[in-house]
């Protein structure tokens, strides 16, 4: 019969701006891989079917709902020749290949904030105006897709640093919007970092820090 | 079906305590913010705040802050409007809803409201 | 806190006729990330619940027919209904979903003549 295929384990999604995949171990010897995934209250789709990869993308599918919480296994399938050369899923006696269980994943509550952009600042005597990209997301609404603002509105807020090239304290603000207003000392260059921020999260609330933008740097000026 | 479905009427004294609740069918509770709004008696709507399932994260309209309280249990995945300290002003018709899939898109369900009386 | 003003305070129509409301926030509702207009329209009948007509100002809610039309953009706001029928004859909202707190404006109550 063979020895029985192992079983996946360290399965992890991995996402950001809901571009997901879900990852696993080991790399697989004498057998492949399948996944499935379904809602709560769906059927198991499959995925990735007899795949050698430790990993499969699934953000075709959570994109369709992202506030769905989504489950996931990996299957372990022998080789398994049929008469049509193609492994099969199930034994000769149809029993289901061993298989592991993903953690649950809700896209909305969970996908990580990808580091955001400065996409302008402009000076106005002793006002800055610092606006971030709107970035976009492979979520869909009739065939466009949305921007992270579009999918979680109010839910979303940005918080920046910003300091005095010449020294290191920073002074923070923030925004519902993707603008933020701040007095800055007149005759002052300033640097920037924002961040994406969801502060009713309880996991992954805040993404990476944006590259730093300074005032006064040649491709900078004022809009870039 | 998305459904939301509210406690009874109640007639209460002023000075006591009202819990109503709202239970929601028919999607995923913890990733939805519920909002409560208030409509007087021949009067407009005003919203009171909202409660997000999954962290218990809540807004209040400064008006109801400190006698509503927002809560919600994801085991029966409902929500909860507790409002204390009762007084005439507070006759109404409470309603629940559900915020709309996409980002600041409105409130897309609602209860069928709970009448909340309050009478010496 | 952003205040919303509908105008008018009550209206009266004939069936077919086109009706057209206004609804002015005390501050831009446009996103500038995303360029929406965060603003809200809804229907409420008596002893019913409100039911939602349009999002981001002039998107249709699924099943909303397609007499009712939302337009505006910053400040300035319109629903219209361009054919009236007998079943639209209710106290119609705007709201501001822009920013905490939300705000509703006072209604317009929409009559048959």
């Known amino acids: 019969a063979g020895t029985p295929p192992g079983k996946a384990f360290n399965l992890t999604w991995i996402s950001a701006d809901f571009k997901t995949i879900l990852a696993w171990q080991p790399k697989p010897t004498n057998y492949t891989y399948t996944v499935q995934i379904s809602t709560k209250s769906g059927d198991w789709k499959y995925k990735c079917t007899g795949t050698t990869d430790t990993e499969c993308a699934l953000t075709d599918e959570i994109v369709k709902d992202v506030k769905q919480t989504y489950l996931a296994r990996v299957l372990s399938v022998p080789w398994r020749n049929s008469t049509h050369g193609k492994e099969t899923l199930f034994g000769t006696h149809g029993e289901e290949p061993p298989f592991t269980n993903a953690p649950e994943f809700t896209p909305y509550l969970e996908t990580n904030l990808g580091a955001p952009t400065i996409q302008s600042f402009e000076q106005v005597g002793t006002k800055v105006n610092v606006t971030v990209e709107d970035e976009r997301t492979l979520v869909r609404r009739n065939n466009t897709f949305l921007s992270l603002r579009d999918v979680f509105g109010k839910d979303l807020i940005y918080t920046l640093a910003y300091w005095k090239s010449s020294s290191s304290g920073a002074k923070t603000a923030a925004t519902n919007t993707n603008e933020f207003l701040i007095d800055v000392d007149k005759g002052e260059n300033y640097c920037f970092s924002v961040q994406a921020v969801i502060p009713s999260r309880t996991v992954n609330r805040a993404s990476t820090d944006s590259p730093v933008e300074c005032m006064g740097q040649e491709h900078h000026h004022h809009h870039h | 079906e998305v459904q939301l479905v509210q406690s009874g009427s109640e007639l209460k004294k002023p000075g006591a305590s009202v819990k109503v609740s709202c239970k929601a069918s028919?999607?995923?509770?913890?990733?939805?913010?519920i909002e409560w709004v208030k409509q007087r008696p021949g009067q407009g709507l005003e919203w009171m705040g909202d409660i997000l399932p999954y962290s218990g994260s809540t807004n209040y309209n400064e008006n109801f802050k400190g006698r509503a309280t927002f809560s919600a249990d994801t085991s029966v995945s409902t929500a909860y409007l507790q409002i204390s300290s009762l007084k005439a002003e507070d006759t109404a018709v409470y309603y629940c809803?559900?915020?709309?899939?996409?980002?600041?898109?409105?409130?897309?369900?609602w209860g069928q409201g709970t009448l909340v009386t309050v009478s010496s | 806190d952003i205040q919303m003003t509908q105008s008018p305070s009550s209206l009266s129509a004939s069936v077919g006729d086109r009706v057209t409301i206004t609804c002015q926030s005390s501050q831009s509702l446009l996103s500038s990330g995303n360029q929406k207009n965060y603003l809200t329209w809804y229907q409420q009948k008596p002893g019913k619940a409100p039911k939602l007509l349009i999002y981001w100002a002039s998107t249709r809610e699924s099943g909303v027919p397609s007499r009712f039309s939302g337009s505006g953009s910053g400040t300035d706001f319109t629903l219209t209904i361009s054919s009236l029928q007998p079943e639209d004859f209710a106290t119609y909202y705007c709201?501001?979903?822009?920013?905490?707190?939300?705000?509703f404006g006072q209604g317009t109550k929409l009559e048959i003549k």
């Open positions: 809803a559900r915020s709309g899939y996409y980002g600041n898109s409105g409130f897309a369900y």
């Open positions: 709201q501001n979903d822009y920013t905490y707190p939300l705000t």
């Open positions: 028919g999607y995923t509770f913890i990733t939805y913010w």
